[in-house]
C-alpha cells in the first residue's frame, strides 16, 4: 500500500485531516500527549480502520478498549474503507490516560479522498483504475512485470502536413488519439472537497520536453483536447469538481530512448492544501503513474513480408520486373520509387530502416531515416512517413557521415539464445572498423547511441571496414528454416568459390567462362581465375576477414557450424585495400518469406547451366526457399551495390511483445 | 574523356575556410576516382585527398586531416574540397585529377594512385 | 622533405637518354607497383606519363620507360627532345598514413 501522510494529533484542538483511500497514513499520538499521561486508547467511526503496533515486541492488535503504553516504540496507522460524503465526517477519538488525571481526548476528523491516476500498467490494452499503490511508481520487465508504454507520436495522420503528429501541440482526430496512450484520473470527494484543495499534473523538468500530455474535456472528441503538459510546460493546476469523477488524458511521448533518456517518464498528480490562503500550498498526496517509451524494433529476414520499395532509374526496367514478380509470388505490396523522386539514387536499403514500435493498444510501422542523405534523402519523410506510419532519424544531417552510416550497414539477426540469455527479437548487427585509425571508418556514434539505447536488440558490432563499400549486408544475410533455430546464416565464402571451381576444372571444365554473356566485360575462365595467386592471396584476405565475422557472429548469436551455409563468392581488393563482389555478390540478396531475389552470378556454364547458381540452388532449395537469380549486372553490380542494396522491405512485427522480455 | 575544372579558390585569411569544386564535363564523375593534389609557389606536387567513385570512404594527407573534407555530389558531377582552419602552409594551386574506375580489371589496377585526368587548378592564397 | 627522393636536376642533349632516380622505403616503392610518373611544363598541369611503374598512357611517346628495382624506381627517356624539358615528378601508393606520395621533383634541361 502507498505511503500516506502523518498526522499528529494534539489534545488542545480538533484536527483536520484528509486520508487518500489506499494510502497509509502515520498518526503520531505521543509528541502532543500531555505530560503526566502514560497510554492512549483509541475509538473510530465504522469507516476507519486503526493499526497500532508495538515494537519489541513486534506485537499487533486491532482496536477496541486495549490501552496502549505512550513510547516511541508505538505505531499507530490508519486506513480508511470509502470516501467520505462529507468534510469530515469520519472520527478517530484518542483518549490519554495517567495515574492521577481522568482521560484527556484529542480528537481528528477525517475526511476520506478516492485520487488515483491510473494508466495501462498491466498492458492489456485497457486502462483500469488503481488506487494509489506502490508498483505504479516502478517500470518491471518481463511477462510478469507492469507499468504503462508510450509511444512516440511520430507518424503523419494529416497528409496535408509535412510535420510528424508530435511536432504540434494539436489533436488531429480520434486516429491521433490512437496513438497516444490513456491516462485516467479518477476522483471520489465531498462536494466541496476542492475549495480547499487543489490538484496539479505534473512532469519532471528533466523530462517534460520528452512528452505531451492532451485533457480531454467533455466527451473524447478529439477536437475537445488542450494540452495541459509538454516541452513549454510542466505542470498543471487541474479545474476537478466534487464528488465522483473520472477525467482523462491522452499522453504522447516525443523522443526515442537515446543516450541521455533511458525512455522512462512518470506523470504525478499532487494534492496540495490550499485552505489556509495566508500560507503556501501545501502537499498532501501525491501519486504517479511510470511510462516506458516504447523502443524502435528492427524486424529480420525471418519475419513475413509486407511491402517491398525499389526506385525506378535510367535502364533498370528488366530488373523492376523481376522484383516486382518476386514481390508478386511473397504477396507483398510493392512500392516503386519513380526517378524524378530519387534523383538517380537507386540505392534503397541505404536511406533507410523499416522497423515499428508497439503499445498494447496499438502498432505503428517506423521508418529510421538515415543520415546518407542522398538523392533519395526526400523519400521516407514525404513518401513513407504518413497516417500510421511513423518517422524517425538520428545522425548529422549535414556531412560528418561515412559510408557505414548507411543501412546496407544495419542488419539484425532473427531472434537467438545464447547460452542462458534469450534474445526474443534478435540481435542488432552493424559494421565498424576492427581499430580506430587516421582513416578508419565507423558508423556515427549517434546511430550507435541510438540503437543500443532501445534495449530490446543488443546490438553486435561486425568488422565491415574491409570492404570498398563497408556494410554487412556484403559478406551475410539471414533466411528462415524449417528447422533447428528457424533460419540459417548465409555467409560469402571464397574457399567454397576456389572449391567448387577446383572440382570442375578436376571434370574437365577448366576453360567454361564467367561472365559470359556480358557485353564490355573480361570473360575469364575457370583455369585462369584458379591460376591467379594474386586474386587468390586477395581472396585469402577477404576469407580471413569473414572468419572474424563468423566466429564473432558464432559467439554473439550462440550459433553452430550447422546454422551457417557458406555461399561461394569472390572478391577483389581495389584501390586502398578495399574489397568489393568480382562477380555479382549473391549473399546480397531479397528475402521475401521463402522467396530469394539473388544477384545472378554469371558463373561458368557447364552442362547447359551456371555452377554457382547449380550450387547455390542445392544448398538453399532443401530448406523450401525458391531461388530467383536477378540480373543486376550493369544497373547494380558495376556501381558497387546489389539487389539487397536497392530494395528494402517492410516486414511483419513480432508476435513477441518486447516488455515481455528482460533486456 | 572527362574534363575537371576547378573553382573556389581565393585570398583567405589565417583560420578562414574555402570550398573548392571540380565540375566535370564530357563524362559521368561517378565512374571515377578523384584525388586532389596541390603545389606550393615554386615548390613540387603534393597529394591532399581522394574519394573513391563508390563514394564510400575517403583518404587525406597527414597535413591536412581533420581540417579538410573531400565530398561528391554525382547529380551535379562535382566533387569538393572543405577547406576549413586554413594556415599559410596551405597556400597553393590546387589541383583537382581523375582516373577512370575500370570495373573490368581482374584485381586492383592503383588508379586511385595515379591521376590521368588534370584540371587547370585553382589558387588559394592564406595570408593576413 | 618529400617522402620519394629525387635528384634535383638531371640534363642531357638532343638525341641522348637520362634516367631520372624515386626512392623510396619497402613500405612504398618497394611493397607496391603503384609507381607513377609525371611531367609538368612551366605554368601547366601535371601530365600521367608512366603507372604501374612501367605502363605508358594511350598517347604518350615509346621514349618514355619506367622501371623498379627494391625500392628505387627509374624514369628513363631515350632519344631526348626539346619539349622534354620540364619538370618530372614521381609518385607511389604507401603503406603511412599518407597513402600517396610524391618525390620532390627533377628539373629535366635539355642542353
Known amino acids: 500500500m502507498a505511503q500516506g501522510t502523518l498526522i499528529r494529533v494534539t489534545p488542545e484542538q480538533p484536527t483536520h485531516a484528509v486520508c487518500v483511500l489506499g494510502t497509509l497514513t502515520q498518526l503520531d499520538v505521543c509528541s502532543s500527549a500531555p505530560e503526566d499521561c502514560t497510554s492512549f486508547s483509541v475509538n473510530t467511526s465504522p469507516g476507519v480502520v486503526v493499526d497500532i503496533a508495538h515494537s519489541p515486541p513486534a506485537k499487533k492488535k486491532s482496536t477496541g478498549s486495549s490501552t496502549w503504553p505512550l513510547d516511541p516504540g508505538v505505531e499507530v496507522t490508519l486506513t480508511m474503507k470509502a470516501a467520505s460524503g462529507s468534510t469530515g465526517d469520519q472520527k478517530v477519538q484518542i483518549s490519554y490516560h495517567g495515574p492521577k488525571t481522568p482521560p484527556v481526548k484529542a480528537l481528528l476528523y477525517l475526511t476520506g479522498v478516492e485520487i488515483s491516476l491510473s494508466a495501462d500498467i498491466t498492458r492489456t490494452g485497457k486502462v483500469k483504475p488503481t488506487r494509489a499503490v506502490e508498483d505504479k511508481r516502478t517500470w518491471t520487465w518481463g511477462p510478469c512485470g507492469q507499468g504503462a508504454i508510450l509511444l512516440v507520436n511520430c507518424d503523419r495522420d494529416n497528409p496535408e502536413s509535412s510535420a510528424m503528429d508530435c511536432e504540434d501541440d494539436e489533436v488531429l482526430d480520434s486516429k491521433d488519439l490512437k496513438d497516444m496512450s490513456l491516462m485516467t484520473l479518477s476522483t471520489k470527494t465531498p462536494q466541496d472537497f476542492f475549495t480547499r484543495h487543489t490538484l496539479v499534473l505534473h512532469v519532471a523538468r528533466s523530462e517534460m520536453d520528452k512528452v505531451r500530455v492532451f485533457q480531454a474535456t467533455r466527451g473524447r472528441l478529439s477536437s475537445r483536447c488542450r494540452v495541459v503538459l509538454g516541452p513549454k510546460q510542466p505542470s498543471h493546476y487541474l479545474m476537478v469538481p466534487g464528488g465522483k469523477h473520472n477525467m482523462d488524458f491522452y499522453v504522447e511521448a516525443l523522443a526515442f530512448p537515446d543516450t541521455n533518456f533511458p525512455g522512462l517518464i512518470t506523470l504525478t498528480v499532487s494534492m496540495l492544501d490550499t485552505s489556509k490562503l495566508e500560507l503556501p500550498e501545501a502537499v498532501v498526496f501525491q501519486d504517479s503513474v511510470v511510462f516506458r517509451v516504447a523502443p524502435w524494433i528492427m524486424t529480420p529476414n525471418t519475419q513475413p513480408p509486407q511491402e517491398v520499395y525499389v526506385c525506378s532509374i535510367f535502364e533498370n526496367e528488366d530488373f523492376l520486373k523481376s522484383v516486382t514478380a518476386l514481390a508478386m509470388q511473397a504477396r507483398c505490396k510493392l512500392t516503386i520509387c519513380p526517378e524524378e523522386e530519387n534523383m538517380d539514387d537507386q540505392w534503397m536499403q541505404d536511406e533507410m530502416e523499416i522497423g515499428y514500435i508497439q503499445a498494447p493498444h496499438k502498432t505503428l510501422p517506423v521508418v529510421f531515416d538515415s543520415p546518407r542523405n542522398r538523392g533519395l534523402k526526400e523519400f521516407p519523410i514525404k513518401r513513407v512517413m504518413g497516417p500510421d506510419f511513423g518517422y524517425v532519424t538520428r545522425g548529422p544531417q549535414t556531412g560528418g557521415v561515412s559510408g557505414l552510416d548507411s543501412f546496407g550497414n544495419l542488419e539484425v539477426s532473427p531472434p537467438v539464445t545464447v547460452g542462458d540469455k534469450e534474445y526474443p527479437l534478435g540481435r542488432i548487427l552493424f559494421g565498424d572498423s576492427c581499430y580506430p585509425s587516421s582513416d578508419s571508418r565507423e558508423m556515427h556514434q549517434a546511430l550507435q547511441d541510438f540503437l543500443s539505447a532501445q534495449q530490446v536488440q543488443a546490438p553486435v558490432k561486425l568488422y565491415s571496414d574491409w570492404l570498398t563499400v563497408g556494410h554487412v549486408d556484403e559478406f551475410l544475410s539471414f533466411v528462415p528454416a524449417p528447422d533447428r533455430k528457424g533460419f540459417r546464416l548465409l555467409l560469402a565464402s571464397p574457399r567454397s568459390c576456389y572449391k567448387l571451381f577446383q572440382e570442375q576444372q578436376n571434370e574437365g571444365h577448366g576453360d567454361a567462362l564467367l561472365f559470359q554473356g556480358i557485353k564490355k566485360k573480361n570473360q575469364q575462365k575457370i583455369k585462369n581465375i584458379l591460376s591467379n595467386t594474386t586474386l587468390r592471396e586477395h581472396n585469402s584476405f577477404v576469407e580471413r576477414c569473414i572468419d572474424w565475422n563468423r566466429e564473432l557472429l558464432k559467439r554473439e548469436l550462440g550459433l553452430a557450424e550447422s546454422d551457417i551455409i557458406d555461399i561461394p563468392q569472390l572478391f577483389k581488393l581495389k584501390e586502398f585495400s578495399k574489397a568489393e563482389a568480382f562477380f555479382p555478390n549473391m549473399v546480397n540478396m531479397l528475402v521475401l518469406g521463402k522467396h530469394l531475389g539473388i544477384p545472378k552470378p554469371f558463373g561458368p556454364i557447364i552442362n547447359g547451366r551456371c555452377c554457382l547458381e547449380e550450387k547455390v540452388c542445392s544448398l538453399l532449395e532443401p530448406l523450401g526457399l525458391h531461388c530467383t537469380f536477378i540480373n543486376d549486372f550493369y544497373t547494380y553490380h558495376i556501381r558497387h551495390g546489389e539487389v539487397h542494396c536497392g530494395t528494402n522491405v517492410r516486414r511483419k512485427p513480432f508476435s513477441f511483445k518486447w516488455w515481455n522480455m528482460v533486456p | 574523356q572527362v574534363q575537371l575544372v576547378e573553382s573556389g579558390g581565393g585570398l583567405v585569411k589565417p583560420g578562414g575556410s574555402l570550398r573548392l569544386s571540380c565540375a566535370a564535363s564530357g563524362s559521368t564523375l561517378s565512374d571515377y576516382f578523384v584525388s586532389w593534389i596541390r603545389q606550393a609557389p615554386g615548390k613540387g606536387l603534393e597529394w591532399v585527398s581522394f574519394?573513391?567513385?563508390?563514394?564510400?570512404?575517403?583518404y587525406y594527407a597527414d597535413s591536412v586531416r581533420g581540417r579538410f573534407t573531400i565530398s561528391r555530389d554525382n547529380a551535379k558531377n562535382t566533387v569538393y574540397l572543405q577547406m576549413n582552419s586554413l594556415r599559410a602552409e596551405d597556400t597553393a594551386v590546387y589541383y583537382c585529377?581523375?582516373?577512370?574506375?575500370?570495373?573490368?580489371?581482374?584485381?586492383?589496377?592503383?588508379?586511385?594512385?595515379?591521376?590521368?585526368?588534370w584540371g587547370r587548378g585553382t589558387l588559394v592564397t592564406v595570408s593576413s | 622533405q618529400s617522402a620519394l627522393t629525387q635528384p634535383r636536376s638531371v640534363s642531357g642533349s638532343p638525341g641522348q637518354s637520362v634516367t631520372i632516380s624515386c626512392t623510396g622505403t619497402r613500405g612504398d616503392v618497394g611493397r607496391y607497383n603503384h609507381v607513377s610518373w609525371y611531367q609538368q611544363h612551366p605554368g601547366k598541369a601535371p601530365k600521367l606519363i608512366i603507372y604501374n611503374v612501367y605502363e605508358r598512357p594511350s598517347g604518350v611517346p615509346d621514349r618514355f620507360s619506367g622501371s623498379k628495382s627494391g625500392n628505387t624506381a627509374s624514369l628513363t627517356i631515350s632519344g631526348l627532345q626539346a619539349e622534354d624539358e620540364a619538370d618530372y615528378y614521381c609518385s607511389s601508393h604507401s603503406r603511412s598514413s599518407t597513402p600517396v606520395l610524391f618525390g620532390g621533383g627533377t628539373k629535366l634541361t635539355v642542353l
Open positions: 585529377s581523375s582516373a577512370n574506375d575500370d570495373v573490368d580489371d581482374i584485381v586492383a589496377p592503383g588508379r586511385g594512385y595515379y591521376m590521368d585526368v
Open positions: 574519394i573513391p567513385s563508390a563514394n564510400t570512404f575517403t
